[in-house]
Interface confidence: medium
């Protein structure tokens, strides 16, 4: 059998195989050693007994999508049946005090591969034997501790395969410079040691995507916005847009990235090299936000000029490139800075990413302030309580609810939360009455809200000990002290 007979039904064309050569991978036309690595079709009864105690599940993930030319990393994690895990020596053991259907196991081992390898025969002086080989016959690499690696992973994509010896979790990175754009399939077959041969335990496949577009995501944040995920924001308050470029292999690390913004409100185009930008919409309505991200990335060099005779061009990735330039220095003195310009790469190409969103701008509560706090007269039966009126103003739209959260002086441990609907006039002036049980310093968070916005102000308030001899007190106003955006209110007792 050949690798492609074993590993997958999908056969890429000769053109695809030729133009998608992966560095360090081998052609799936190679022969597969079926004696050492038996091949079982889906539904074969032997799968049931391929692992003691149940089936092993392999989970394949990747950091796709990958910008063409960057590295894409695939990770395979094996999930063992309940109560089983891999120990430090690579053996599979039962977890202590863990019950599965078979109850508690007397034998600590599911698979004791250390013991198997110690009494294994037929080895030469290097620890190499006829069975310590991959399916294509290549010997296992002898890293330190390789004997503790008891799983063989065979990755297969684009008519090529890659073999890896590993533990219950492995990672493989592939450079995508020669990979055709679009979705591709990665298949992985996993074998375990079984004496001097191997047994298949899991198969898994996943789609990955190679793209010539920079994968771009934009997060949007605005103070007082009640729901940041609904793409509805408030007029007259800055929105912070933060661009996240999906570049897990840091392919664009040496690139200068330009961000070109159009906010859709006739403010024109804004270009920045910073991934964050603030923009304030001054009108209500629906606006189309457009972002173009541009980066000069390492790319393929242009093909050499064709010979003068007419010939049919061969399609290649270069035909999709928007622009490319060689950075090979010219004669001395031609360009004094050329050598220092782009490290490690001779050719560059402009790559683009796009983001579009429709955002809705509405009125909202822009600001809330406590302008006065008044100690309210309390009747005798509640000597331990203080009643305080907060006079609050706001700007922007009219709130429909008010909440006060009373907490400890650090503003971290909530003691009491009260929310109530409010009916406020156009001037947005309201009085909020709250009870404080006992003396001490309290943190008061006061929020005003409507359907789309939530505005907050915080203050520290100091409530003194009550004088039981004073059944009635006159209302007193508090003194104000500005303290780093928090108002410190001293409650004087007369």
């Amino acid at each position: 059998k050949r690798f492609h007979d074993v590993l997958g039904n999908e056969r890429p064309s000769a053109y695809m195989r030729e133009h998608n050569q992966l560095n360090g991978w081998s052609s799936d036309e190679n022969d597969w050693n079926e004696k050492l690595y038996p091949v079982w079709k889906r539904g074969d009864m032997r799968w049931k007994n391929s692992w003691k105690g149940g089936r092993v599940q392999a989970v394949l993930t990747s950091d796709s999508p990958a910008l063409v030319g960057s590295n894409i990393t695939f990770a395979v994690n094996l999930i063992f049946p309940r109560c089983q895990k891999e120990d430090a020596n690579g053996n599979i053991v039962y977890e202590k005090n863990c019950r599965n259907e078979a109850g508690l196991s007397a034998d600590p081992y599911v698979y004791n591969w250390t013991a198997w390898s110690e009494d294994s025969d037929g080895e030469n002086g290097t620890g190499q034997s006829h069975h310590n080989v991959f399916p294509d016959g290549k010997p296992f690499p002898h890293h330190p501790g390789w004997r503790r690696w008891n799983f063989i992973y065979v990755f297969h994509t684009l008519g090529q395969y890659f073999q890896k010896l590993g533990r219950c979790s492995v990672r493989v990175s592939v450079n995508t410079a020669n990979v055709t754009l679009g979705p591709q399939l990665m298949e992985v077959t996993v074998y375990r040691r079984h004496g001097r041969a191997y047994v298949p335990i899991a198969q898994v496949k996943d789609v990955y995507v190679v793209t010539d577009q920079i994968p771009v995501f934009v997060t949007m944040f605005q103070k007082n916005d009640r729901n940041s995920s609904d793409e509805t924001f408030l007029k007259d308050l800055p929105i912070m847009f933060d661009v996240l470029i999906h570049d897990p292999s840091h392919f664009l690390n040496y690139s200068t990235i330009n961000y070109k913004w159009s906010f859709g409100d006739n403010t024109g185009l804004f270009v920045s090299t910073n991934h964050t930008v603030n923009h304030t919409y001054v009108l209500n309505g629906t606006f189309s936000l457009n972002l173009t991200v541009k980066a000069a990335a390492p790319g393929p060099c242009p093909p050499p000029p064709p010979p003068p005779r007419p010939s049919k061009p061969t399609p290649s990735l270069a035909t999709t490139l928007k622009s490319y330039d060689s950075n090979t220095p010219g004669p001395a003195g031609d360009n004094p800075l050329e050598l220092s310009r782009i490290p490690d790469e001779n050719c560059q190409i402009n790559r683009y990413g796009h983001f579009q969103a429709t955002i809705t701008i509405v009125e909202g509560i822009l600001e809330v302030n406590i302008i006065q706090m008044t100690d309210v007269l309390m009747p005798v039966p509640w000597p331990e309580s203080s009643l305080i009126d907060f006079v609050v103003t706001c700007q922007g739209s009219i709130p429909t609810e008010v909440c006060t959260i009373i907490s400890d002086p650090t503003c971290e441990i909530t003691q009491n939360t009260v929310c109530s609907p409010v009916d406020v006039d156009e001037m947005c002036l309201l009085t909020v009455r709250r009870t404080f049980n006992g003396s001490g310093t309290y943190c008061v968070n006061l929020t005003l809200g409507d359907d789309t916005s939530l505005a907050l102000t915080s203050t520290l308030i100091s409530v003194p000990d009550r004088d039981p001899a004073s059944p009635l007190r006159m209302a007193n106003e508090f003194d104000y002290k500005d303290d780093d955006d928090k108002l410190e209110h001293h409650h004087h007792h007369h």
């Epitope: 270009v271 090299t273 330039d325 782009i342 560059q348």
Partner: antibody, heavy 122, light 106 residues
Framework: QVQLVQSGAEVKKPGASVKVSCKAS????????MGWVKQRPGQGLEWIGA????????NYNQNFKGRVTMTVDTSISTAYMELSRLRSDDSAVYFC???????????????WGQGTLVTVSS | EIVLTQSPSSLSASVGDRVTITCSAS?????MHWYQQKSGTAPKLLIY???NLASGVPSRFSGSGSGTDFTFTISSLQPEDAATYYC?????????FGGGTKLEIK
Amino acid sequence: QVQLVQSGAEVKKPGASVKVSCKASGYTFTANWMGWVKQRPGQGLEWIGAIDPSDSFTNYNQNFKGRVTMTVDTSISTAYMELSRLRSDDSAVYFCTRSGYYGSPKLGGDYWGQGTLVTVSS
Amino acid sequence: EIVLTQSPSSLSASVGDRVTITCSASSSISYMHWYQQKSGTAPKLLIYSTSNLASGVPSRFSGSGSGTDFTFTISSLQPEDAATYYCHQWNSYPCTFGGGTKLEIK
């Protein structure tokens, strides 16, 4: 060797437009941004904007927005800067400068044109 | 925009003197460039990326600094160094230049 050669001096009336050219030679024209800088008599340097000749991606200083247009003709390795609705304070020398390789901020303007004097007078 | 404040705005020094010009940025930047401009000519790049000497520029010119504070130094002033010197940043749009330092030889 690298050279940037600009068009000759211009005299314009207020409200008119002027288009200054900058012909590049001695390097791959599309590999570097082309910047434009204004210098009024006896004054300092003011950045007008820049264009990437590989895709005509432009970036203008807000102070000139709506009045400046930068273009390129890659077939003749030439960059253009057009300034419209001219005012008397637009009287200045305008320089083109070859700027960062692929927009890299690590590099300044390593080559400059000789400058084009634009006089705006009624 | 990032404002570059150059000081001094003018200075007079003798041949052989060590001359230092500073450039302060209103926000932190990664790279500063320095130019020399003589009357009636285009600016000439002397230092790029804060401390790299442009090709053909004498080694008496140097640059240093990081963040918001950058320095340009002429270790031993020569008669041909009489000119106006500008700092320049292209870390953030719009690119900006310092106001210039006019250097005269006594």
